[in-house]
Interface confidence: medium
């Protein structure tokens, strides 16, 4: 099989406050074995925004039911955007291990937020 | 109920081919992830190979990779192998299963056909 | 190749008897393990998945436990249905998804 790739078609999106935010991400292959997870920022700071394995995140829901093999899409959509959401989002593939093990990420997505329209 | 029925299953001779089906009822065919796994005489359970749920993604098993072809038609609920090259010990009940995962990359089967015969000797 | 061992290759259990029935691996998969069922003739049923999780319609006398590298399927009071073949398999990671030797049940 060919090496996974995590792509991120999206360079930048800008999206109006209060409105939501889809961030595109796919995958082409289900090998290594492993989840996806979302962060903002890059490095040991980086926020992490979804987890596909477990976790609660409110505002976070997926464009397509990624938690069954229905595709190897991981599209999100963050609701009720603010300035405090702008930032580079990654989309990273993790391989299954103990604990599990970063393989890959995509090259971002820039969030802009503009002002809500009045 | 879920249903799979596999056919085409049958005697050839090493090197020829052979064509196996699978009917799928009782559930959204589409969503989920298909596989063959086969059991020769007398003999434990292997998998030969899985397709994912659009057909863009296909995984083997060493022993038929380059030999066998796994496809799916969603529009007619059906899982095939295409089997060439046949040898003696791809002799086996072959078994259509359903995944039944919960996470994409995990799998496992919680459903299978009966199974149909394929017997590869001179 | 994640390899997975069952022991013992047969077991003899009188009806009414409990059966402990082993899955070892060759390396750590979590609990990432299914468990299932074949009689002779017959497909292959799913018993357990997630190394202790119940099937849909799986009655409570099966259970399964461990992580890691080893794994118990228990059945607390055989039936005379349960004398069957039973095998382990892991999906911690694929290709290949491998399944173990197989442990026979049968009445003693």
């Known amino acids: 099989e060919e090496e996974l790739q995590v792509i991120q078609p999206d360079k930048s999106v800008s999206v109006a406050a209060g409105e939501s935010a889809i961030l595109h991400c796919t995958v082409t292959s289900l090998i290594p074995v492993g989840p996806i997870q979302w962060f903002r920022g890059a490095g040991p700071a980086r926020e992490l925004i979804y987890n596909q394995k477990e976790g609660h995140f409110p505002r976070v829901t997926t464009v397509s039911e990624s938690t069954k093999r229905e595709n190897m899409d991981f599209s999100i959509s963050i609701s009720n955007i603010t300035p405090a959401d702008a930032g580079t989002y990654y989309c990273v593939k993790f391989r299954k291990g103990s604990p599990d093990t970063e393989f890959k990420s995509g090259a971002g997505t820039e969030l802009s937020v503009r002002a809500k329209p009045s | 109920d879920v249903q799979l029925v596999e056919s085409g299953g049958g005697v050839v001779r090493p090197g020829e081919s052979l064509r196996l089906s699978c009917a799928a009822s009782g559930f959204t065919f589409s969503n989920y992830a298909m596989s063959w796994v086969r059991q020769a005489p007398g003999e434990g359970l292997e998998w030969v190979s899985l397709?994912?749920?659009?057909?863009?993604?296909?995984y083997y098993a060493d022993s038929v990779k380059g030999r066998f072809t796994i496809s799916r038609d969603n529009s007619k609920n059906t899982l095939y192998l295409q089997m060439n090259s046949l040898r003696a010990e791809d002799t086996a009940i072959y078994y259509c299963?359903?995944?039944?995962?919960?996470?994409?990359?995990?799998?496992?089967?919680?459903?299978w056909g009966l199974g149909t015969p394929v017997t590869v000797s001179s | 190749e994640i390899v997975l061992t069952q022991s013992p290759g047969t077991l003899s259990v009188s009806p009414g008897e409990r059966a402990t029935l082993s899955c070892r691996a060759s390396?750590?998969?979590?609990?990432?393990l299914a468990w299932y069922q074949q009689k002779l003739g017959q497909a292959p049923r799913l018993l357990i998945y997630?190394?202790?999780t119940r099937a849909t319609d799986i009655p409570d006398r099966f259970s399964g436990s461990g992580s890691g590298t080893e794994f118990t399927l228990t059945i607390s009071s055989l039936q005379s249905e349960d004398f069957a073949v039973y095998y382990c398999q892991h999906y911690y990671d694929w290709p290949p998804v491998t399944f173990g030797g197989g442990t026979k049940v049968e009445i003693k």
């Open positions: 997630d190394a202790n």
């Open positions: 390396q750590n998969v979590r609990s990432d």
């Open positions: 299963a359903k995944d039944g995962a919960a996470h994409y990359y995990d799998i496992f089967f919680d459903y």
């Open positions: 397709i994912t749920t659009n057909g863009d993604g296909a």
